[in-house]
Interface confidence: low
């Protein structure tokens, strides 16, 4: 129940040993009491004891003092428990009876006779202080005291507030006198079920399951969980968010392991060639005429530049070359002609125009042909017109540059941001990298473009390989694999040295 009405009988006096009807008890009045507690009535009436009733064994004969007794038969004070909100008012009827029968259970004996009764009506607040009273009539006097107290775990002015101290996963608290919770040290919250983490523990990146600890969420480290963990394998980079690898100045590639200033740092291009910080190795050498090789380290044949015009054939000599001219041509490069338009010197549909009063001529070549006599098919890629590692392709009368990812323009001369077209779905963060854009996905999404919604407990299926540890994120729908030494990849599936696939968060 929520409370107890307690009645302490102190002394009963019936000096003449008389009953209410005027008769006397023989040999004396063997006295027990019946108590009836009910709701407040201005005029006390018979009827059920709505708040409870109790009887005592025989407590004495005629006049006697009632001693306190805490257990067993004849317990004093008498206890009338109730399990409702105490209303603050009551009616109490105390009857003294004489029994000729059993001392312990006089209630059941026949022939019981009323000695006297008192009725008390009034208000009574819950509290520990006893209210003492004494009632007299012509024959008897009764001294008693009474109070209402709350049962264990009940509190408040009407014992209506239930509070049971606890120290388990549902809460860590004691109860205040008014029934409100008082959190144990290190705990907070309405139900004192939220631990107070280590002072300074990062609010978002750290948490605790017991007081004074700071457990880092995946991707964070440090005593206060305020340092992000960069992506596994990040060489020359840092992070501002977990699993990021933001490259230091001059470094590129997924793991910031490609030197973007290779030309300056290493001067790899030989023989006066031009170095540009591009291409699959981080640099490209553009050779001067007469040289070839990755670093322009190889000298070409002197005839390699095709110096002989008008179909002349080139012969290498010690430090030079010699042109053997076809009939009708002369000069060091066979550049002079002895022919006229009458000799039909223009090939491939070229049209002939006379010059110098018909002593010489010039050929006007159709598209795709060149040379003094339109004898050469045009290769528009010989001048290496495509910048930034673009690939030159002859397309009929013109040529096109096929650009590497991240470049555009007729000659691939313009660098574009892959992130400009917002490729990342569901609020993913885009990063421009050498090999294209990369998305960092928010919790609950994955895929190259954060297009996949994850709806299961991601670690339950054991997605991490090679002994890696799986961590779920802020929600159970994303996971991060913490790879052991020697393995990389979002699931730690690749030994170091093999190319991992990229998703930041699986």
């Amino acid at each position: 129940g929520s409370g107890i009405f307690q009645l302490r009988l102190q002394e009963f006096v019936n000096q003449r040993g008389m009953l209410a009807n005027g008769q006397s008890c023989e040999p004396g009045c063997r006295t027990f009491f019946r108590i009836c507690l009910k709701h407040f009535q201005a005029t006390f009436s018979e009827g059920p004891c709505t708040f409870g009733n109790v009887s005592t064994p025989v407590l004495g004969t005629n006049s006697f003092v009632v001693r306190d007794k805490n257990s067993g038969s004849g317990r004093n004070p008498l206890q009338l428990p109730f399990n409702f909100t105490w209303p603050g008012t009551f009616s109490l009827n105390i009857q003294a009876w004489h029994t000729p029968g059993d001392d312990l259970r006089p209630e059941t004996s026949p022939g019981n006779s009323l000695i006297s009764q008192i009725i008390i009506q009034g208000s009574l607040a819950v509290g520990k202080i006893w209210r003492t009273d004494e009632q007299n009539d012509t024959l008897t006097r009764l001294s008693y005291s009474y109070r209402v107290i709350c049962s264990d775990n009940y509190y408040g002015e009407s014992c209506s507030r239930l509070c049971k101290k606890r120290d388990d996963h549902f809460g860590h608290y004691e109860c205040q006198p008014d029934g409100s919770l008082s959190c144990l040290p290190g705990w907070t919250g309405k139900y004192c079920d939220q631990p107070i983490c280590l002072s300074g523990c990062h609010e978002q990146n750290g948490y605790c399951s017991k007081p004074d600890e700071c457990i880092c969420r995946p991707g964070w480290q440090g005593r206060l969980c305020n340092e992000c963990i960069p992506h596994n394998g990040c060489r020359h980079g840092t992070c501002s968010i977990p699993w990021q690898c933001a490259c230091d100045e001059g470094w590129g590639g997924l793991f910031c392991d490609q030197d973007l200033n290779y030309c300056t740092h290493h001067s790899p291009c030989k023989n006066g060639s031009t170095c540009s910080n591009s291409g699959p190795k981080g640099y490209t050498c553009t050779c001067l005429p007469g040289y070839t090789g990755e670093h322009c380290e190889l000298g070409l044949s002197k005839c390699a530049s095709n110096p002989c015009r008008n179909g002349g054939s080139c012969k290498d000599q010690e430090n030079s070359y010699h042109c053997l001219c076809p009939p009708g041509y002369y000069g060091q490069h066979c550049e002079h002609s002895t022919l006229t338009c009458a000799d039909s010197p223009c090939f491939n549909g070229g049209s002939c125009r006379e010059r110098n009063q018909g002593s010489s001529y010039a050929c006007e070549c159709p598209p795709n042909f060149t040379g003094s006599n339109c004898e050469k098919k045009v290769d528009r890629c010989t001048s290496n017109p495509c910048a930034n590692g673009g690939q030159c392709q002859n397309r009929g009368p013109s040529r096109t540059c096929r650009c590497r990812p991240g470049f555009t323009g007729t000659h691939c001369e313009l660098h574009i941001s892959d992130c400009a077209r917002s490729p990342c779905a569901h609020g993913g963060t885009c990063h421009d990298l050498e090999n294209g854009p990369v998305c960092t996905c928010p919790a609950g999404f994955s895929g190259r473009r954060c297009e996949v919604r994850i709806t299961h407990d991601a670690c339950a299926s054991g997605p991490c390989f090679n002994g890696a540890t799986c961590y779920t994120g802020l929600s159970p729908n994303n996971f991060v694999c913490n790879c052991p030494y020697g393995f990389v990849g979002s699931r730690c599936e690749f030994p170091v040295g093999l190319p991992p696939s990229f998703p930041w968060v699986a």
Epitope: F170, G171, K190, Y191, D193, P476
Partner: nanobody
Amino acid sequence: EVQLVESGGGLVQPGGSLRLSCAASGFTFDDYAIGWFRQAPGKEPEEISCISSSGGITYYADSVKGRFTISRDNAKNTVYLQMNSLKPEDTAVYYCATPGIAACRGIHYTGQGTQVTVSS
């Protein structure tokens, strides 16, 4: 008015099964966690199981772990307690309760209870 009504109790032999239901009304059911506790005569109430508003978080007391399963059907405003491998010590009055919030914290409303007796 919030109401929780338990049903499904009864007499069952040791090793048998029962499925208790708790039908709720008077509040937005899928906003609240719902739990079960039991009380045997003369004993303290014992928390058995609880399920969060979303159904994503469930709690089981050690004494019933692996034998009892809690679930909820938000469309029917009902929580179920499937009790398998019942033992005599599972005999008690079973009550369903809600803390009146989404997580399993404390008790705000309870039902009238349903008696489960496990005896041969």
